[in-house]
């Protein structure tokens, strides 16, 4: 008995060949002996089977002694033994129809799991092996799970179902939804305008959802919502925004926020969440703001930073083109009685300057003492 594997939703063509290369009478029946289709001269006739509206043949091949049964939009329950009766002969073909579906949707959030479930006819014992876009093979039984999806898992996954040494291949396009960066940090001098950008790492035709930026200022005891917004077909509309700070938001993707001024009271960490329509879970991006201020009060030159700095970061005060006068792994440094000239306050990580603020110290003219 010949075995043919089919894919749910696809079309299959079961072959039946007579020894005479001419149009003769034939019938296709199922295992219950119910007629599916046949011919009467050059006319196609159909029986009372449940395949009625999905079964067909190729009349153009009958003259060559070929009498195929074509079944469209295959269903798992179409799995059966089909019998072709021609020239007092019976040809049997066993059709096994398989389906492979993703747990929810093929658009998944970063960190979620992809579960592929194999639908198979009763009595079959298939094995399934999926190949990632980069060629990593994962084997499974009726279900196959891939955990902790990341952006780079996006692409075409090719799954092969093996049964009776025959195979059928499914291609599933997976899109992992995430922001391009999990976290970002912005370093600004006090008073500068701050730009926060949240680019997405995927493109889809229609993107609808809602989002919010929660902010935990270093100086504040609790976090607060700075802005909430809606996303409709890639258009951004602000729903609610705090009065302090008065954030502005771009109307188009990528999501873009502007803080008019970097101030010490705004330094801290934010979490932008984006809930997409018809998706469980949310996309997250962390954003951090570090603010620097250099001031001179009487005989004291001070440099301070606010916000989430690593303990390895170095804060230094130096006179231009000279060695650092003071350099500490702290959030504030100062110099008493600084020399006149252009002073630089530097925040650096392993020698790499992250933030720099210049302040000019004017000479102090002392009145000479008369003899």
């Amino acid at each position: 008995k010949k075995v043919v594997l089919g894919k749910k939703g696809d079309t299959v063509e079961l072959t039946c060949t007579a020894s005479q290369k001419k149009s003769i009478q034939f019938h296709w029946k199922n295992s219950n002996q119910i007629k599916i289709l046949g011919n009467q001269g050059s006319f196609l006739t159909k029986g009372p089977s449940k395949l009625n509206d999905r079964a067909d043949s190729r009349r153009s091949l009958w003259d060559q002694g070929n009498f195929p049964l074509i079944i469209k939009n295959l269903k798992i329950e179409d799995s059966d033994t089909y019998i072709c009766e021609v020239e007092d002969q019976k040809e049997e073909v066993q059709l096994l129809v398989f389906g492979l579906t993703a747990n929810s949707d093929t658009h998944l959030l970063q960190g979620q799991s992809l579960t592929l479930t194999l639908e198979s006819p009763p009595g079959s014992s298939p094995s399934v092996q999926c190949r990632s876009p980069r060629g990593k093979n994962i084997q499974g039984g009726k279900t196959l799970s891939v955990s902790q999806l990341e952006l780079q898992d996006s692409g075409t996954w090719t799954c092969t179902v093996l049964q009776n040494q025959k195979k059928v291949e499914f291609k599933i396009d997976i899109v992992v939804l995430a922001f391009q960066k999990a976290s970002s940090i912005v370093y600004k001098k006090e008073g500068e305008q701050v730009e926060f950008s949240f680019p997405l790492a995927f493109t889809v035709e229609k993107l609808t959802g809602s989002g919010e930026l929660w902010w935990q200022a270093e100086r504040a005891s609790s976090s607060k919502s700075w802005i909430t917004f809606d996303l409709k077909n890639k258009e951004v509309s602000v729903k609610r925004v705090t009065q302090d700070p008065k954030l502005q938001m771009g109307k188009k993707l990528p999501l873009h926020l502007t803080l008019p001024q970097a101030l010490p009271q705004y330094a801290g960490s934010g979490n932008l969440t984006l809930a997409l329509e018809a998706k469980t879970g949310k996309l997250h991006q962390e954003v951090n703001l570090v603010v620097m201020r250099a001031t001179q009060l009487q005989k004291n030159l001070t440099c301070e930073v606010w916000g989430p700095t690593s303990p390895k970061l170095m804060l230094s005060l130096k006179l231009e083109n000279k060695e650092a006068k003071v350099s500490k792994r702290e959030k504030a440094v100062w110099v008493l009685n600084p020399e006149a000239g252009m002073w630089q306050c530097l925040l650096s990580d392993s020698g790499q300057v992250l933030l720099e603020s210049n302040i000019k110290v004017l000479p102090t003219w002392s009145t000479p003492v008369q003899p």
């Epitope: 992809l114 980069r134 990593k136 994962i138 891939v146 902790q148 990341e150 780079q152 898992d153």
Partner: antibody, heavy 120, light 111 residues
């Protein structure tokens, strides 16, 4: 803390087989691939293959197909590599490593290595 | 298999200066979106340590003086400014296909 603890040094005869273990702690063992990597003295690193403990899925470098066999015990959170028909070319440090990627290969946590010496 | 070629084989850099290590793949290991290239550091008697994934993404806990760049077939690992503790052998590795392969390594010495 994620850790991979490997079995100790092995001194083997040519033609013999060696089985190295790698015990994982600090994460869900069944969900992440365990990779096996070879490093010969003064030489570079060579990927042998991998196993996904939850499903038993394996992928091998063709160079090692037929000689390397990976298994995993999800009760003890331990992965094993057996290498057969040993020759002096197999004298090396063998590392197990974790790959957090579902469809890719990069290795974020490594065991300390198991030294295998093949000598008659 | 994709062959990864690292240069130079060894490198001596003064403390505080920049170290540049190159890695060339025998075929492109990038799509329009990502480069499937990763970097590791190995100190004598220790296993390799993961530094950078997908050409430029620093693994958490890795100092900002390490940076990666490149696409297609040519990739670079930069360390600036180098510190005493950076004395090690550095390896690149592609994950474009099976089998993933490593470069021969670049030994960095601090003067």
């Amino acid at each position: 803390e994620v850790k991979l603890q490997q079995s100790g040094t092995e001194l083997m005869k040519p033609g013999a087989s060696v089985k190295i273990s790698c015990k994982a702690t600090g994460y869900t063992f069944s969900s992440y691939w365990i990779e096996w990597i070879k490093q010969r003295p003064g030489r570079g690193l060579e990927w042998i293959g991998e196993i996904l403990p939850g499903s038993g899925s394996t992928n091998y470098n063709e160079e090692f197909t037929g000689r390397a066999t990976f298994t995993a015990d999800t009760f003890s959170n331990t992965a094993y590599m057996q290498l057969s028909s040993l020759t002096s070319e197999d004298s090396a440090v063998y590392y197990c490593a974790r790959s957090v990627s579902a469809s890719n290969w990069y290795f974020d946590v490594w065991g300390a290595g198991t030294t295998v010496t093949v000598s008659s | 298999d994709i062959v990864m070629t690292q240069s130079p084989a060894s490198l001596a850099v003064s403390l505080g200066q920049r170290a540049t290590i190159s890695c060339r793949a025998s075929q492109s290991v990038s799509t329009s979106s990502y480069s499937y290239m990763h970097w590791y550091q190995q100190k004598p008697g220790q296993p390799p340590k993961f530094l950078i994934k997908y050409a430029s993404n620093l693994e958490s806990g890795v100092p900002a003086r390490f940076s990666g760049s490149g696409s297609g077939t040519d990739f670079t690992l930069n360390i600036h400014p180098v510190e005493e503790e950076d004395t090690a052998t550095y390896y690149c590795q592609h994950s474009w296909e099976i089998p993933p392969t490593f470069g021969g390594g670049t030994k960095l010495e601090i003067k």
